[in-house]
């Protein structure tokens, strides 16, 4: 059975350029390794933002990525992307792969549109 991945359709980044959103999959398979990848879609191009593999022991991910962090619990991943600027506004897709044990399954969310608004520069004070 194919896995269904759900993520919110829209998220507004904070004034500090931080966006957080959940990525959930169902049905919940008994899986030892789950790989979660965040992809950004721009026009027809898909680029990898960050990826990590979660296990029963390793529930904190994206340690190799300064701009991504995430925690895994059962079939839900709480994703955080930081360092975002207005030019990073776009559609971010969550891909979930059940890596081990076999069989392999892949599921793709419909994407979360992240809106980033650069903060207004502070006016000079005399």
């Amino acid at each position: 059975e194919a896995i269904q991945v759900t993520q919110p359709s829209v998220v507004l980044a904070s004034s500090h350029g931080v966006a957080s959103f959940p990525c959930e999959y169902s049905p919940s398979h008994n899986t030892d390794e789950v790989r979660v990848t965040v992809l950004r879609q721009t026009n027809d191009q898909m680029t990898e933002v960050c990826a990590t593999t979660f296990t029963e022991k390793n529930t904190v991910g994206f340690l190799d990525y300064p701009f991504c962090s995430g925690t895994f619990n059962e079939s839900r991943v709480n994703l955080t992307i930081q360092g975002l600027r207005a030019v990073d506004t776009g559609l971010y897709l969550c891909k979930v792969e059940l890596m081990y044990p076999p069989p392999y399954f892949v599921g793709m969310g419909n994407g979360t549109q992240i809106y980033v608004i650069d903060p207004e520069p502070c006016p000079d004070s005399d």
Partner: antibody, heavy 120, light 108 residues
Amino acid sequence: QVQLVESGGGVVQPGRSLRLSCAASGFTFSSYGMHWVRQAPGKGLEWVAVIWYDGNNKYYADSVKGRFTISRDNSKNTLYLQMYSLRAEDTAVYYCARGGILAAGIFDYWGQGTLVTVSS
Amino acid sequence: EIVLTQSPGTLSLSPGDRATLSCRASQSGSSSYLAWYQQKPGQAPRLLIYGASSRATGIPDRFSGSGSGTDFTLTISRLEPEDFAVYYCQQYGTSPFTSGPGTKVDIK
């Protein structure tokens, strides 16, 4: 541009072994799952094996399980297929293919193929 | 494993005709995780469609895919001489990754 070049094919007797190689260039090899897909003469496509990004996980088609071993050397950007106990039904063109960024099971780029003939 | 069936086995058409190729999955485990490939004699296959309906990079818009669940279709709106080839569907939602037997589109 993405390029995949297979080598190592040839004529081999039943029961013998052969190792295929696939040299990859034009992309970050270690970020992609890689596959071997074969095509017997005049037949359709048959997926053989996949090795995931870091090389830790490998899956095989039932028809080759226990006889074929897929491996990769990310430092050399090279994919391998070690084939043991070859049978006549393993005769085919063997392609290496890159798994897509959207899903590792999409074969988005292919090599030109290398022919393996198992015959006595 | 998911078994894919393609029909017809051969499609004899003329340049300019519309081609409709069918692919049916034995179970809906593949969801919309279906791809189409084109293969010409002596060449490696080429990815045309993924996600049942998204065109791969560089594929002309006369190629379109549709369907979900168990029934999928590849449509070539107006056949060009270079489109005469064998077309395979493939599911990539779960392992083993399986392909259909192919549909040959040849010149009438």
